[in-house]
């Protein structure tokens, strides 16, 4: 048995931040689980991890330098990514693993979400007027 995951096909990260919601066909509230977000077609970069255990507080971390936070819903985990760079525009995949109680469960690979990072439009500062000649 595999858990099904739904993600938005595409998100635009304005102001270099985005909320990516991973919706599961599974209730996580009474489980010990590891939800993670992976970057790239080959899911090579683990962007963020949300570790949950029904009796303890959620642990959220990134070992790859991403600024991330996570929120748990009944059948979802939302990743909040900040300080994204334009060159981090890519496809991102949600992954879920139920560690306990057994048996171990994970998800069918989802279609992923393309996150398009739009750079901040910095307004050019007006030219500083030079000293006026008398």
């Amino acid at each position: 048995n595999k858990i099904l995951v739904k993600q938005s096909p595409m998100l635009v990260a304005y102001d270099n931040a985005v909320n990516l919601s991973c919706k599961y066909s599974y209730n996580l509230f009474s489980r010990e689980f590891r939800a993670s977000l992976h970057k790239g077609l080959d899911s090579a970069v683990e962007v963020c991890v949300v570790y949950g255990n029904y009796s303890q507080q959620l642990q959220v971390y990134s070992k790859t330098g991403f600024n991330c936070d996570g929120k748990l819903g009944n059948e979802s985990v939302t990743f909040y990514l900040q300080n994204l760079y334009v060159n981090q525009t890519d496809i991102y995949f949600c992954k879920i693993e139920v560690m306990y109680p057994p048996p171990y469960l994970d998800n069918e690979k989802s279609n992923g979400t393309i996150i398009h990072v739009k750079g901040k439009h910095l307004c050019p500062s007006p030219l500083f007027p030079g000293p006026s000649k008398p």
Partner: antibody
Framework: QVKLQQSGAELVKPGASVRLSCKAS????????IHWIKLRSGQGLEWIGW????????QYNAKFKGKATLTADKSSSTVYMELTGLTSEDSAVYFC??????????????WGQGTMVTVSS | DIQMTQSPASLSVSVGETVTITCRTN??????LAWYQQKQGKSPQLLIY???HLVEGVPSRFSGSGSGTQYSLKITSLQSEDFGNYYC?????????FGGGTKLEIK
Amino acid sequence: QVKLQQSGAELVKPGASVRLSCKASGYTFTEYIIHWIKLRSGQGLEWIGWFYPGSNDIQYNAKFKGKATLTADKSSSTVYMELTGLTSEDSAVYFCARRDDFSGYDALPYWGQGTMVTVSS
Amino acid sequence: DIQMTQSPASLSVSVGETVTITCRTNENIYSNLAWYQQKQGKSPQLLIYAATHLVEGVPSRFSGSGSGTQYSLKITSLQSEDFGNYYCQHFWGTPCTFGGGTKLEIK
């Protein structure tokens, strides 16, 4: 179809031990947790613990630690519960039941027929 | 450990009536609750899982409701075959405690 076949009734002396069995069929034995439940005459159901044959994981109700020991034999798809130091308080019907995972919500949809244990001198 | 308080302990009703059995917990169990029926000399039978989901094959006169710490099993238009013992059980961690049971008798 899923079936849990439990061993027959036992009459045992105080202080003795007994081993009850629960033979599973109709599904992959190593993929499901088996729970054990006690029912004393005139009283309610009492949860003893569970055993997961896939990894030999066990959880006990603290009340039954030292009283019940859960094991399994994968080759015969059987889970065992040994009860030691028996007293009249252990006289009861003992059930095994399979835990199913309904998309993250647990329940016990399949039960054995129960084994009656009578402790008497 | 989670405490399960089931009430009433017993009730005597007539065929055709409606009954409600309640189960209270001392902390939020997020709907991780099942209801069982047990008849004398038989194994328990699962009626409802996840607090509100009726098991396939169980008559629709049985229904479950509730959330948080309070849950109910309702049986409408009671039939003679509905008499017996009813138990709730939580699955919010271990021990997976049962309620004390409700004995449903014919008046």
